[in-house]
Interface confidence: medium
C-alpha cells in the first residue's frame, strides 16, 4: 500500500510567493512620474515577476514632524486621489496581486512615530486600519517600530483589528534591529505578525555565519511563518557586493517563509552607481533613459529592458526563482534541514512528503570549493541521493537538467546551485 499523503497546511496568500516593496512611488516610476495612476501601468511588470503582494507607500498626507497635519485616511495629492487608489486596487486584484499599504505615520520626518503624542498617533493608526480595510486593502505595513513606545501591545491591537476583519489580511512590522532577542520579543506577543528586520544584514561574510544566523532564527521562531529580507526597506545592494546578489536571491526564495524584496532588487539596482541618487530610493532603471542626470552612467545591462532580453541576467534569475517558489510544494511549505557542506558553504534541503525535493548549495566564498555534503546531519526523512538534477546555477556555463554527482560537487566562487531530486520511499 502506498504511504498516506501528509495533510497540506493551511496556506495564506503571502505564503505562496514574494512581496515587492515600492516605498517611493516617484523613484519607482522615474522622472516626471510617480503617482498611483502610473503605478497601475506597471502592474503587468509586477505580474511578470510572479510576486504575490505589493507593499505600497506610505502615500498618506504627512507634514513632516507635525501630528496634526498627518492624515492616514487621506492620500497625498501628489500621489493621486482615493479614486486612483481604488482603481489600482481593482486592477491589482484582477492580476492576483495583493496590495499592502504602509501606514508608517511620520514618513517624511525625523522620527517615524513622532517623538510625542504616542496615543494620538496609535489612535490614528487604528482608525486608518479600519478605514483602509473597508476600502479593500489586503494588509498593512508599519516600519521603524523600535521608535514606537510599547510597540508589542500596539502591534497586538492592530493585529486583532486586521485579523478580526479577515484571516486573509496581513500585518507586517519592520524594524531596523538585527538583534535576535529584540526580534523574538516583538514576535512573542504577535502570533501571525510578519516581521522584517536587519537580522540578515551582516550575513554576507561567510556561509557558516549565514547558516548559523538562519538556523538560529528558525530554531528560535519554531513553527511560525517567517519573512526573509536583509532590511525593512532598503535595497540588497545597500548590504551586498554585486557578486553575492544572485546567491542571496536564490537563498531568499528557497528558505521557508516569505521573501520580501524592494523594487530594483530584481535588477541589482545600486544607488552607489547613480551619483546623487538617495541610497534609500534611487530611481528605478527601466531603460537607459531612466537616469538622465548622467546619461552614460547607465548601461543596458543595468536596466529592466536590457535584463529582460538576457536569459542570463539577474532579472531572469529572479523570475525563474519566483516561479519555482510559487508552484513547488517543497518550496511553498516544505520542511527545512540545513547540513554541513564544508567551510564557506551553506546548504540545505527543502522537502514535503512525496513531492519533488530541492537541495540548495551556496558558496559565499571568493574561491571555488568542493562540497563535502554531510548527509549524516540529515534525518532519515530527508536523506540525500547519489545524484540530483541541476535546476539552475547562479553562474552561467552549467548544463541545466543534467544530473550531478553530489559526492563530486564543485562550486565556483559565489555560486549557488538549486538541485532537484525525487522522493524515494
Amino acid at each position: 500500500r502506498a504511504p498516506r499523503c501528509r495533510e497540506l497546511p493551511a496556506q495564506k496568500w503571502w505564503h505562496t510567493g514574494a512581496l515587492y516593496r515600492i516605498g517611493d512611488l516617484q523613484a519607482f516610476q522615474g522622472h516626471g512620474a510617480g503617482n498611483l495612476a502610473g503605478l497601475k501601468g506597471r502592474l503587468d511588470y509586477l505580474s511578470s515577476l510572479k510576486v504575490k503582494g505589493l507593499v505600497l507607500g506610505p502615500i498618506h498626507k504627512n507634514q513632516k514632524d507635525d501630528v496634526a497635519q498627518t492624515d492616514l485616511l487621506q492620500i497625498d495629492p501628489n500621489f493621486g486621489s482615493k479614486e486612483d487608489f481604488d482603481s489600482l486596487l481593482q486592477s491589482a486584484k484582477k492580476k492576483s496581486i495583493r496590495v499592502i499599504l504602509d501606514l508608517t505615520p511620520n514618513y517624511r520626518g525625523e522620527n517615524s512615530w513622532f517623538s510625542t503624542q504616542v496615543d494620538t498617533v496609535a489612535t490614528k493608526v487604528k482608525d486608518a486600519l479600519e478605514f483602509w480595510l473597508q476600502a479593500g486593502v489586503d494588509g498593512f505595513q508599519v516600519r521603524d517600530i523600535e521608535n514606537l513606545k510599547d510597540a508589542s501591545s500596539f502591534l497586538a491591537e492592530w493585529q486583532n483589528i486586521t485579523k478580526g476583519f479577515s484571516e486573509d489580511r496581513l500585518l507586517i512590522a519592520g524594524t531596523n534591529s538585527s538583534d535576535l532577542q529584540q526580534i523574538l520579543s516583538l514576535l512573542e506577543s504577535n502570533k501571525d505578525l510578519l516581521l522584517t528586520s536587519s537580522y540578515l544584514s551582516d550575513s554576507g561574510s561567510t556561509g557558516e555565519h549565514t547558516k548559523s544566523l538562519v538556523t538560529q532564527y528558525l530554531n528560535a521562531t519554531g513553527n511560525r511563518w517567517c519573512s526573509w529580507s536583509l532590511s525593512q526597506a532598503r535595497l540588497l545592494t545597500s548590504f551586498l557586493p554585486a557578486q553575492l546578489l544572485r546567491l542571496y536571491q536564490l537563498m531568499l526564495f528557497t528558505l521557508p517563509g516569505t521573501p520580501v524584496f524592494s523594487y530594483g532588487d530584481e535588477i541589482g539596482l545600486d544607488a552607489a552607481a547613480l551619483p546623487g541618487q538617495p541610497m534609500e530610493a534611487p530611481v528605478m532603471l527601466w531603460d537607459e533613459s531612466s537616469f538622465p542626470d548622467i546619461p552614460g552612467a547607465v548601461s543596458a545591462n543595468m536596466t529592466v529592458k536590457g535584463q529582460s532580453e538576457d536569459p542570463g541576467s539577474l532579472l531572469s534569475l529572479f523570475r525563474r526563482l519566483s516561479d519555482q517558489r510559487s508552484k513547488e510544494r517543497s518550496l511553498l511549505h516544505g520542511d527545512f534541514h540545513a547540513f554541513s557542506a564544508g567551510p564557506g558553504l551553506f546548504s540545505y534541503i527543502r522537502h514535503w512528503d512525496q513531492n519533488e525535493r530541492f537541495l540548495v548549495v551556496l558558496n559565499f566564498g571568493d574561491v571555488g570549493l568542493s562540497a563535502g555534503l554531510q548527509a549524516s546531519d540529515l534525518p532519515a526523512s530527508a536523506s540525500l541521493p547519489a545524484k540530483a538534477d541541476l535546476l539552475l546555477s547562479t553562474q552561467p556555463g552549467r548544463e541545466e537538467g543534467s544530473p550531478l554527482e553530489l559526492e563530486r560537487l564543485k562550486l565556483e566562487p559565489h555560486e549557488g546551485l538549486l538541485l532537484r531530486f525525487p522522493y524515494a520511499a
Epitope: P278, M279, E288, S289, P292, D293, I294, P295
Partner: antibody, heavy 125, light 113 residues
Amino acid sequence: QVQLVQSGAEVKKPGASVKVSCKASGYTFTSYQMHWVRQAPGQGLEWMGIINDKHGSTSYAQKFQGRVTMTRDTSTSTVYMELSSLRSEDTAVYYCARGYEDSNTHQHPIFFDIWGQGTMVTVSS
Amino acid sequence: DIVMTQSPDSLAVSLGERATINCKSSQSVLYRHNNNNYLAWYQQKPGQPPKLLIYWASTSESGVPDRFSGSGSGTDFTLTISSLQAEDVAVYYCQQYYNTPITFGQGTRLEIK
C-alpha cells in the same frame, strides 16, 4: 546670500589624514548635492566625488576609492571630506562645490554653480 | 573615462577682440534622449575658485555677461568671448558631466596681447 565656507589651510605629513569641512548657508542644504574637486598647484581641476546631502549616499572617483570619505551633518549644514594615507602628490587646493539643480525637472546634472573658497592642503615631511 | 582636451593651452588677444577656446571630448557628450550636450565652461581667476559661465554647452549662467557664449555639439565645443575685456584674463576650463568620473579639460590661459 548663498555661500560655502571651508575650513582653513592644513599641513600634514605623508601617511596622515586630513579632514576638510564645508559649511553651507543661504539655501536649503538638503536639496542639493555637494561635490569635492581638487587642484594641484599650477594644475587643472580634478573631481573627487559626491555626497547627496539629503541621504548621505556617496560616489567617489575610482582614483580616490578607499582613501576618501565624504560625510555630512544636516544639523549644521556642513559636509566633510576626509582623505587618508596622504602623499606629496595630494598637495592641492580642495574645493567643495554645490551641484546644480534643474528646478524644472528636479534633476541633478553635475556641474557646479557655487564653490567654496578652497582649502590648501600641503603634504610634506 | 572621458578625456577632455582644450586648445590652445594659452591665448593672447587684444582688448575688444574676439577670443575663441576649443574643447574636444574623447566621446560624444550629446545625449540622444533629450538632445542636450552635457558640457559646461568655467572661468578661474588667480587665487579664486572657478566660476560657472555656461552649461548645456550653450546656456549662460545668470549674471554672466552676454559677450560669453558657448556652441558646439557631440565632441567639439567652443567658448567665445566676443569682445575681450581686461577682467576676462583668467584660465578657462571645459567640463563634461555626461559620465562619471566628471572630467575637466586641462585649461586655457587667456591673456591680453
